[in-house]
């Protein structure tokens, strides 16, 4: 019921989420769990942002991405096996019961003999779209699916980044990622 | 030491207003979701309102679009503003702190103020 | 909204016997396999005392007489053995879903 994104031991991880914030500044706080999101707040929090900047964030965990565009999508540093499970990102849209929350699954596999990452896994993890039912409680917030969205130009552009390590970075930056607000 | 004193309660007039507040101490507030909880005479323990740490609000509907909760992380208050009201609202009313991470349940609650509404 | 219906409503006990309290929930209170159940004990004059949350784990500083145990649906609070200290009201809770909701509460007294 949720997205589930993949990982292979002593890499970096990339949990997608996003929103638009209103006017550029005008941010939300947003708030990353270990744990499915509970009914009011974000679980195990690893790192956590308000109205202007990043307040709280533990070793491994930080936003790559410019979260001050609304890209709040977590990465976790040189990941292990106990990094697997389930991680909430809460939205926190002030007003009554505005909250946005995704429940992301991380899968982390051990560490392959020969490192040649496939383009689908890699493609997918770079550009998901998420889509997702909204509710007030947690058994209501249910992730439908994680589709790409992108052109076959794209897409042999892409090939070519592939084999560059730095590949979840370029991609992020290419502005091709969808965003959900 | 966790403390919640929560003050403002009275006796209003029906379609009256007040306001409550609760004074935290003895823990980083701002991190924390807070709720209201009332208990009728009955004993029965109805929540009416929660605030999380970003801000956002939940209200049951039988208080919804009358009832407002706000919260001052500067000064370590929560507040319960309370409009139209009726007499089915009187009750303790009692200020929780929900538990951390996760806000739904509670681990400290306050000694509670009396909400009398009547004319 | 989810009914908790909270049986006995009130239970006469014995000092040193077992004293077991129901609650049962309208619709699943499981999550992620996790049971979003809460038990409270309020004695008279003063405000609820959380006992159990996630239906099993004993609070910091409840005596290890006070267990809870459940899954799904139905949960049971249980105390052995009853002390006089006991004495009081015991109240559940779901934090499944928005409006958070209580059992109607069951008295314990002595026999």
């Known amino acids: 019921s949720e997205v589930e994104y993949r990982a292979e031991v002593g890499q970096n991880a990339y949990l997608p989420c996003f929103y638009t914030p209103a006017a550029p500044g005008n941010l939300v706080p947003v708030c990353w769990g270990k744990g499915a999101c509970p009914v009011f707040e974000c679980g195990n929090v690893v790192l956590r942002t308000d109205e202007r900047d990043v307040n709280y964030w533990t070793s491994r965990y930080w936003l790559n991405g410019d979260f001050r565009k609304g890209d709040v999508s977590l990465t976790i540093e040189n990941v292990t096996l106990a990094d697997s499970g389930i991680y909430c990102c809460r939205i926190q849209i002030p007003g009554i019961m505005n909250d946005e929350k995704f429940n992301l699954k991380l899968v982390i596999k051990p560490a392959k003999v020969t490192p040649a990452p496939t383009l689908q896994r890699d493609f997918t993890a770079a550009f998901p779209r998420m889509l997702t039912t909204r509710g007030h409680g947690p058994a209501e917030t249910q992730t439908l699916g994680s589709l790409p969205d992108i052109n076959l130009t794209q897409i042999s552009t892409l090939a070519n980044e592939l084999r560059d390590s730095r590949l979840a970075n370029d991609l992020r930056d290419s502005g091709a990622t969808i965003r959900i607000g | 030491e966790v403390k919640l004193v929560e003050s403002g309660g009275g006796l209003v007039k029906p379609g009256g207003s007040l306001k409550l507040s609760c004074a935290a101490s003895?823990?980083?507030?701002?991190?924390?979701?807070m709720s209201w909880v009332r208990q009728i005479p009955e004993k029965r323990l109805e929540w009416v309102a929660a605030i999380s740490s970003g801000g956002s609000l939940y209200f049951p509907d039988s208080v919804k679009g009358r009832f407002t909760i706000s919260r001052d992380n500067a000064r370590n208050i929560c507040y319960l503003q309370m409009n139209s009201l009726r007499s089915d609202d009187t009750a303790m009313y009692y200020c929780?702190?929900?538990?951390?991470?996760?806000?739904?349940?509670?681990?400290?609650w306050g000694q509670g103020t009396t909400l009398t509404v009547s004319s | 909204d989810i009914v908790l219906t909270q049986s006995p409503a009130s239970l006469a006990v014995s000092l040193g016997q077992r004293a077991t309290i129901s609650c049962r929930a309208s619709?699943?209170?499981?999550?992620?396999?996790?049971?979003?159940m809460q038990w409270y004990q309020q004695k008279p004059g003063q405000p609820p005392k959380l006992l159990i949350y996630a239906a099993s784990n004993v609070e910091s500083g409840v005596p290890a007489r006070f267990s809870g145990s459940g899954s799904g649906t139905d949960f049971s609070l249980n105390i052995h053995p009853v002390e006089e200290d006991d004495i009081a009201m015991y109240f559940c809770q779901q934090s499944m879903k928005v409006p958070l909701t209580f059992g109607a509460g069951t008295k314990l007294e002595l026999k």
């Open positions: 619709e699943s209170v499981e999550y992620y396999g996790t049971s979003l």
């Open positions: 003895g823990f980083t507030f701002s991190r924390y979701a």
């Open positions: 929780a702190r929900g538990r951390e991470a996760d806000g739904g349940y509670f681990d400290y």
